[in-house]
């Protein structure tokens, strides 16, 4: 089977959502946990993560073979404390398989804005913290 993990971000007003999406087959979900780490280059684990989520075994419908499960970590107001390097990971507690997504960063600037860099598929986002809009 093939399990795929991607990272993305979205902004809602002053909130920043960091999203880890895992695509997997129904039968591959059992025992899998997806988690988001900050500033953990080597020891990213569910125990040291900001948030974790068990993969769903049921896509809700029967006519599909692949499921997407989404972990969303919401930062209500980005501050300098949120600057750092983030990574989406997944691990099977059953088989020991480990997946690591690309590193991405939040950079808080002196002007009160922040940027999210390192996201794939045109996901380099630059946000204005004060205005709450894409800049």
């Amino acid at each position: 089977g093939c399990i795929n993990i991607t990272s993305s971000a979205s902004q809602e007003g002053t909130r920043l959502n960091l999203i880890c999406t895992v695509w997997h087959k129904k039968e591959e979900a059992e025992g899998f946990v997806v988690f988001l780490c900050k500033d953990r280059s080597g020891d990213c684990s569910p125990e040291t993560s900001l948030k974790q989520l068990r993969l769903k075994r049921d896509p809700g419908i029967d006519g599909v073979g692949e499921i997407s499960s989404q972990l969303m970590f919401t930062i209500s107001q980005v501050t300098p404390l949120h600057s750092g390097t983030y990574q989406c990971c997944a691990r099977s507690q059953k088989s020991g398989i480990r997946l690591q997504g690309h590193f991405f960063s939040i950079l808080f600037t002196e002007t009160g804005n922040y940027t999210v860099t390192g996201l794939k598929q045109r996901q380099h986002l630059e946000f204005s913290h004060n205005e709450g809009t894409l800049s």
Epitope: L53, R57, D58, G60, D62, G63
Partner: antibody, heavy 121, light 107 residues
Framework: QVQLVQSGAEVKKPGASVKVSCKAS????????MQWIRQAPGQGLEWIGA????????RVTQKFRGRATLTADKSTSTAYMELSSLRSEDTAVYYC??????????????WGQGTTLTVSS | EIVLTQSPATLSLSPGERATLSCRAS??????LHWYQQKPGQAPRLLIK???QSISGIPARFSGSGSGTDFTLTISSLEPEDFAVYFC?????????FGGGTKVEIK
Amino acid sequence: QVQLVQSGAEVKKPGASVKVSCKASGYTFSDFWMQWIRQAPGQGLEWIGAIYPGDDDARVTQKFRGRATLTADKSTSTAYMELSSLRSEDTAVYYCARRGIAAVVGGFDYWGQGTTLTVSS
Amino acid sequence: EIVLTQSPATLSLSPGERATLSCRASQSISNHLHWYQQKPGQAPRLLIKYASQSISGIPARFSGSGSGTDFTLTISSLEPEDFAVYFCQQSNSWPLTFGGGTKVEIK
């Protein structure tokens, strides 16, 4: 044993909103899709949408998109369905129902008792 | 959206008779179809899962068949408590949908 207990009957005016709750017990709430279905007086069953409490993945049918909001509180094992901009045609019994294990049951194996919503000026 | 068409809308039969209810899907849904029974003032009850699989606690006189687009619910010998409304529902794709229902009434 699995139980779904819904909130009581509601009477609302056109344009108002309503929030119906469905408290689940007897199973792992976050592992099963919760459905919302309604039935107007003398009519058939109409699927509104579903939510997976494990990751808050929610699906709402086109007709109710923008008007129905599905949420779930894992700490209390309670699912909610909020319907806004109510009109008289929304008068119906609203049910929550659990989708059974995929490929094993698949259908809606447990149902709430129903919540009657009356929209009238 | 998959449309499920149930026929007939009403079936008038006597106790002891055989009831045959039909559900037709607007496109192929494999065996991803379920049947429910609903009595007045009650929530629906799951009768048959995945077109033909029985449910624990449901009498053996209820059976289902079909695959693809055409499905049938059969009640081999109607009991007084079987007079109710029957709905089919597909779980093949979003949005999930129900058929319009068939009312089985006493002749």
